[in-house]
Interface confidence: medium
């Protein structure tokens, strides 16, 4: 499924994102447009043989197991499959884990370059939340 | 337990398409990458590409561009490759592995033999 | 793409003795190499992977070693039923690549 912005930001403040450890829901819908250019089932292989999944681009070396990246450590307990699903609740889930683990949204490469300082709150004005 | 279970033999003229299907049972199939891979005499095992069946997601080598193209079918747990302008070339054993990064599990391949 | 260079392209060996396999990468794969044997007219079948890790079912007499550019794959004691080609496979980068083979044979 490819996320309208409003859409996506609508279903990101339903479960919960808006301001989830003081990211407002701009930062989030800006790190999704930059990450998979709002496509739930975006995919993209690095060099270190991991793939990232889904919406939020999250990382099969940490975060999900695809069966196939040596040394997963699969911190959130998912099939990494279960991330390119049109419900987005088992990014929104996975990407709640990873904002808390000490790096905040740097863990997100896309939301570094092109969100961070700048003015995010333009990636959901207009929309009816 | 795992298996995966090709389609048979086929014999094609060349410019035509074929279909080769590669069943799968005894896991979730949506989770796991599909890869194909092609062997001929003399030329050793060759990479095709991978398709996540669960989102459709697929690379390919850019060698097979164009020459394949990946489906799959998650409600018969089914991936299926079509090679397309078939030429000699294209006569080889094709098989599906699961893409764990090593190929534990194989198909019994498919012969695509190319002849006018 | 990582090119895999297989050695020797063909071994002769007698039932019992020990033999080494080698498989080289063109460039650094950590370890990320996997090794299959393959009958004549049969599927290729998962010896070893992550270059020293025995896949289910393997007999002990099988083994790999190395990391980065140099593989083995080592058979201690080969029997009857091992002989037939040996491939590389490297999953360190896309596109996945195999090695050209060595077919061990009876001398």
């Known amino acids: 499924k490819v996320f309208g912005r409003c859409e996506l930001a609508a279903a990101m403040k339903r479960h919960g994102l808006d301001n989830y450890r003081g990211y407002s829901l701009g930062n989030w819908v800006c790190a999704a447009k930059f990450e998979s250019n709002f496509n739930t089932q975006a995919t993209n292989r690095n060099t270190d043989g991991s793939t990232d999944y889904g919406i939020l681009q999250i990382n099969s070396r940490w975060w999900c197991n695809d069966g196939r990246t040596p040394g997963s450590r699969n911190l959130c307990n998912i099939p990494c499959s279960a991330l390119l699903s049109s419900d987005i609740t088992a990014s929104v889930n996975c990407a709640k884990k990873i904002v808390s683990d000490g790096n905040g949204m740097n863990a997100w490469v896309a939301w570094r370059n092109r969100c961070k300082g700048t003015d995010v709150q333009a990636w959901i004005r207009g929309c009816r939340l | 337990q795992v298996q995966l279970q090709e389609s048979g033999a086929e014999v094609m003229k060349p410019g035509a398409s074929v279909k080769i299907s590669c069943k799968a049972t005894?896991?979730?199939?949506?989770?796991?990458?599909i890869e194909w891979v092609k062997q001929r005499p003399g030329h050793g095992l060759e990479w095709i590409g991978e398709?996540?069946?669960?989102?459709?997601?697929?690379y390919y080598n850019e060698k097979f561009k164009g020459k394949a193209t990946f489906t799959a079918d998650t409600s018969s747990n089914t991936a299926y490759m079509q090679l397309s302008s078939l030429t000699s070339e294209d006569s080889a054993v094709y098989y599906c592995?699961?893409?764990?990064?090593?190929?534990?599990?194989w198909g019994q391949g498919t012969t695509l033999t190319v002849s006018s | 793409d990582i090119e895999l260079t297989q050695s020797p392209a063909t071994l002769s060996v007698t039932p019992g003795d020990s033999v080494s396999l080698s498989c080289r990468a063109s460039?650094?794969?950590?370890?990320?190499l996997h090794w299959y044997q393959q009958k004549s007219h049969e599927s290729p079948r998962l010896l070893i992977k992550?270059?020293?890790q025995r896949a289910s079912g393997i007999p002990s007499r099988f083994s790999g070693s190395g990391s980065g550019t140099d593989f083995t794959l080592s058979i201690n004691s080969v029997e009857t039923e091992d002989f037939g080609m040996y491939f590389c496979?490297?999953?360190?980068?896309?596109?996945?690549?195999f090695g050209g083979g060595t077919k061990l044979e009876i001398k």
């Open positions: 005894g896991y979730t199939f949506s989770t796991y990458w």
């Open positions: 592995a699961r893409g764990d990064g090593y190929y534990c599990y």
């Open positions: 460039q650094s794969i950590s370890n990320n």
């Open positions: 496979q490297q999953s360190n980068s896309w596109p996945r690549t």
């Open positions: 398709i996540l069946p669960g989102s459709g997601s697929t």
């Open positions: 992550y270059a020293s």
